[in-house]
């Protein structure tokens, strides 16, 4: 004969646990039904009646099967430096992520607590490691034979143009100036790993190899070349 199926609420066998999507109610000492995502327990079960569930109100949610008396509040609206990548529904919290050009400097369980603008490398410095959703740009000094004349969170150090005749040698923040009208380049200017140009040398020495470079952030300073504003919170 098939085993008898118990309907909630029911008293569990000694030493056994309640089934999936059920919970043990200490007061009633019974296995009772959980409420589905998007609902909460309006009335707890008794020995004779099962849990009564009700839908979450606006701006509240439950993501899991539960028996909570009240739904959780959705997080506050996304701040100006964030975009809403998941809306607040009865079954899920709002998720805010940093908008383009920003990264998450301090994460929370879901989404971001603190967004900050990506670092901009100043002239003479190029991007060594690009920013990601969770990490800042890393800048490095342009090595001999390369330059960057921009303030940018994306521009790398580019090779100096190779001149037939050099009018002004290039340096870390300036390209070489040629006297001839048709300079040649050994490779595309945007290429990252390039051979050193032969006829123009930078007027500075090779930077020391920097250790483990990785993401970094932005920085509100009380003075200075107005680095990006300090991050803003997402809750």
């Amino acid at each position: 004969l098939p085993a008898q199926v118990a309907f909630t609420p029911y008293a569990p066998e000694p030493g056994s646990t309640c089934r999936l999507r059920e919970y043990y109610d200490q007061t009633a000492q019974m296995c009772c039904s959980k409420c589905s995502p998007g609902q909460h327990a309006k009335v707890f079960c008794t020995k004779t009646s099962d849990t009564v569930c009700d839908s979450c109100e606006d701006s509240t949610y439950t993501q899991l099967w539960n028996w909570v008396p009240e739904c959780l509040s959705c997080g506050s609206r996304c701040s100006s430096d964030q975009v809403e990548t998941q809306a607040c529904t009865r079954e899920q919290n709002r998720i805010c992520t940093c908008r383009p050009g920003w990264y998450c400097a301090l994460s929370k369980q879901e989404g971001c607590r603190l967004c900050a603008p990506l670092r901009k490398c100043r002239p003479g410095f190029g991007v060594a490691r690009p920013g990601t959703e969770t990490s800042d740009v890393v800048c490095k000094p342009c090595a001999p034979g390369t330059f960057s004349n921009t303030t940018s969170s994306t521009d790398i150090c580019r090779p100096h143009q190779i001149c037939n005749v050099v009018a002004i040698p290039g340096n870390a923040s300036m390209d070489a100036v040629c006297t001839s009208t048709s300079p040649t380049r050994s490779m595309a200017p945007g290429a990252v790993h390039l051979p050193q140009p032969v006829s123009t040398r930078s007027q500075h020495t090779q930077p020391t190899p920097e250790p483990s470079t990785a993401p970094s952030t932005s920085f509100l300073l009380p003075m200075g070349p107005s680095p990006p504003a300090e991050g803003s919170t997402g809750d």
Epitope: A105, L106, L114, A116, R119, K120, C121, R122, P123, G124, F125, R129, T134, S135, D136, V137, V138, C139, K140, P141, N171, A172, S173, Q203, H204, T205, Q206, P207, T208, E210, P211, S212, T213, A214, P215, S216, T217, S218, F219, L220, L221, P222, M223, G224, P225, P227, E230, G231
Partner: antibody, heavy 121, light 107 residues
Framework: EVQLQESGGGLVQPGGSLNLSCAAS????????LSWVRQTPEKRLEWVAY????????YYSDTVKGRFTISRDNAKNTLYLQMSSLKSEDTAMYYC??????????????WGQGTTVTVSS | EIVMTQSPASLSLSVGETVTITCRTS??????LPWYQQKQGKSPQLLVY???KLAEGVPSRFSGSESGTQYSLKINSLQSEDFGTYYC?????????FGGGTKLEIK
């Protein structure tokens, strides 16, 4: 108000270890790069170590490379310097400093009050 | 490493006088140079960054200038609170070295 408060200094024998901490407040800690700078008894300043805001990129001066480790805990707003195989020439006042925002804003804009490390037998 | 040669090492001046402290770098550092002031028993404080820009709250009698690999800090009409030690530093390639300092004493 930006505050950087160092602790953990003291007297240690050559070859010994010491851990410095720097508790930060008054700014968004996780968005700033930080460094340790020391000042010798002769009043010379020496940059020791740097860590970027994400805690992944670290640079060291040659004099401490392999012996000192800089780290940070962005959840606790704290910067650390683990010092091992200490030498008499490591004797100095150690400052926790904010910056540089390397490649963008290249300077130390806030300094702590310092903690004294003395390496002597 | 880049060597920062700061001069003079010390000097004694009176209130109202003008002083220029120089820092010569062993190679180009592309203006990545701050100046700091340190008073007795205190931590250094940022005065100038990017060789010529005054930090917030720094009086206009302070000014920074550069010429090639020589960087200068000028203080016009010295005030009593200006006495202390001044340091230059570079932020080009690591290690980021400091000058030896200039101790400015009151005469």
């Amino acid at each position: 108000e930006v505050q950087l408060q160092e602790s953990g200094g003291g007297l240690v024998q050559p070859g010994g270890s010491l851990n410095l901490s720097c508790a930060a407040s008054g700014f968004a800690f996780s968005t700033y790069d930080l460094s340790w700078v020391r000042q010798t008894p002769e009043k010379r300043l020496e940059w020791v170590a740097y860590i970027n805001n994400g805690g992944i990129s670290t640079y060291y001066s040659d004099t401490v490379k392999g012996r000192f480790t800089i780290s940070r805990d962005n959840a606790k707003n704290t910067l650390y310097l683990q010092m091992s195989s200490l030498k008499s020439e490591d004797t100095a006042m150690y400052y926790c400093v904010r910056g540089p925002f390397y490649g963008s804003a290249n300077y130390f804009d806030y300094w702590g009050q310092g903690t004294t490390v003395t390496v002597s037998s | 490493e880049i060597v920062m040669t700061q001069s003079p090492a010390s000097l004694s001046l009176s209130v109202g006088e003008t002083v220029t402290i120089t820092c010569r770098t062993s190679e180009s550092i592309y203006s990545n140079l701050p100046w700091y002031q340190q008073k007795q028993g205190k931590s250094p404080q940022l005065l100038v960054y990017d060789a010529t820009k005054l930090a917030e709250g720094v009086p206009s009698r302070f000014s920074g200038s550069e010429s090639g690999t020589q960087y200068s800090l000028k203080i016009n009409s010295l005030q009593s609170e200006d006495f202390g030690t001044y340091y230059c530093q570079h932020f080009w390639v690591t290690p980021w070295t400091f000058g030896g300092g200039t101790k400015l004493e009151i005469k």
